[in-house]
């Protein structure tokens, strides 16, 4: 969390941002909140990106003002116009690109004053893994697949029964470049698995950490997976 304050000249207002990550090819949110104003027409929101000449987005007098918008953001940005009056200046970024990563500034001007806060935005690709029993293999084998990751992640297997065991000798992980030549499909195979055990396939890069669990018993197979974005800090 980053909390910024306005300085000199007129009164300062508190602006708060949260560091976040965007999944390339999908839509992302750059979070920013501020002390609300009574009149929408008195609120100006300006989003900037470090190193970029034009504005990322501007909202003033109750509507978007995109005359100074930078080429790289054209047609890809929107604020939540109906939520501005309650202090939400978050920006929706469509079709997140790898090059959208960087430091952003949420700059707010209201009748109470002005303020700004920076936000670190990481971009990459992350997806939920799915773990299945590989019935085609000669021995009991698990196959963990996740369709889109970038940068290249690490894959670690763990087991509930053999906690702390190192499975690197009995697993094999491959990365296959997807058609857009950026993201990769992750496939990891774990050999010699035993029944009545829960195995976890953990995929992690500097943006996200995802885990796929599978519990194999004689009567059933239970799966569970979850994904967590890393380093989401407020400012």
């Amino acid at each position: 969390l980053i909390i910024g304050f306005g300085i000199s000249g007129r009164h300062s207002i508190t602006v708060t941002t949260v560091a976040s990550a965007g999944n390339i090819g999908e839509d992302g949110i750059l979070s920013c909140t501020f002390e609300p104003d009574i009149k929408l027409s008195d609120i100006v929101i300006q989003w900037l990106k470090e190193g970029v000449l034009g504005l990322v987005h501007e909202f003033k007098e109750g509507k978007d003002e995109l005359s100074e918008q930078d080429e790289m953001f054209r047609g890809r940005t929107a604020v939540f116009a109906d939520q501005v009056i309650v202090g939400n200046a978050s920006l929706r970024l469509k079709n997140v690109q790898l090059t959208d990563a960087g430091t952003y500034k949420c700059y707010i001007i209201t009748s109470k004053g002005k303020g700004n806060a920076n936000l670190e935005y990481k971009t990459g690709a992350f997806s939920m893994p799915e773990v299945n029993v590989d019935y085609n293999a000669s021995s009991e084998t698990l196959r963990c697949e996740a369709p889109r990751w970038f940068p290249q992640p690490t894959v670690v297997w763990a087991s509930q029964v053999d906690q702390g065991a190192n499975f690197s000798e009995v697993s094999n992980t491959s990365f296959e470049l997807n058609s857009e030549n950026v993201t990769m499909k992750v496939v990891s195979v774990l050999y010699n698995v035993t029944i009545n055990n829960t195995y976890s396939c953990m995929i992690e890069n500097d943006i996200a950490k995802a885990t796929g669990d599978i519990k194999v018993t004689e009567s059933e197979i239970k799966r569970r997976s979850h994904l967590q974005l890393l380093n989401s800090k407020a400012s």
């Epitope: 306005g6 300085i7 000199s8 000249g9 900037l48 470090e50 190193g51 970029v52 000449l53 034009g54 504005l55 100074e68 930078d70 080429e71 790289m72 090059t99 990563a101 960087g102 500034k105 700059y107 001007i109 002005k114 700004n116």
Partner: antibody, heavy 118, light 107 residues
Framework: EVQLLESGGGLVQPGGSLRLSCAAS????????MHWVRQAPGKGLEWVSG????????YYADSVKGRFTISRDNSKNTLYLQMNSLRAEDTAVYYC???????????WGQGTLVNVSS | DIQMTQSPSSLSASVGDRVTITCRAS??????LAWYQQKPGKAPKLLIY???TLQSGVPSRFSGSGSGTDFTLTISSLQPEDFATYYC?????????FGQGTKVEIK
Amino acid sequence: EVQLLESGGGLVQPGGSLRLSCAASGFTFSSYGMHWVRQAPGKGLEWVSGISGSGGSTYYADSVKGRFTISRDNSKNTLYLQMNSLRAEDTAVYYCARTQWRASLDPWGQGTLVNVSS
Amino acid sequence: DIQMTQSPSSLSASVGDRVTITCRASQDISYWLAWYQQKPGKAPKLLIYGASTLQSGVPSRFSGSGSGTDFTLTISSLQPEDFATYYCQQTTMSPYTFGQGTKVEIK
């Protein structure tokens, strides 16, 4: 550490051409707009030209429009200024600088002197 | 093009003095103004951007204020290393014009 190093300056006759280079290091060059700013001997700063991170947008001062061309090679982390039809009034120290927020400039290179004289 | 006019063009002051430099834009530039310091034979250094935001590493005795067309750079207590030339620059629209500079000299 962010560094910008200009080169290519020197003595050139009026009507001649020169190409300045600015080698960048210590940051993701393609993410930053870049600029050329000049300073004639004993005078103030004059913004000359700017270019977006991708190279897709270029900007010029009226005094150099049609004569100077700004470009960049992101694979080489290098900014260029091609200067044609040079005039005596183009004599100056030329600085390259990185866009910080909007067109505020930080850091700057150490500068390279261009002397247009017969 | 937006014209930037600085005043005074030069001033003499003593260590410890409070110094104020003004910059006027020929049209509304909102808060998009930067201030630079330049010492003889050196490249300029960014002090303030967005009219009032101090660049990282710049001493807090420097401050900026203003919006629209009128802006001020203030040095609250002048130090020996502050004797230099100061420039304003509008950063909202190409061409990104500079003021003509203010030279701060030792009295």
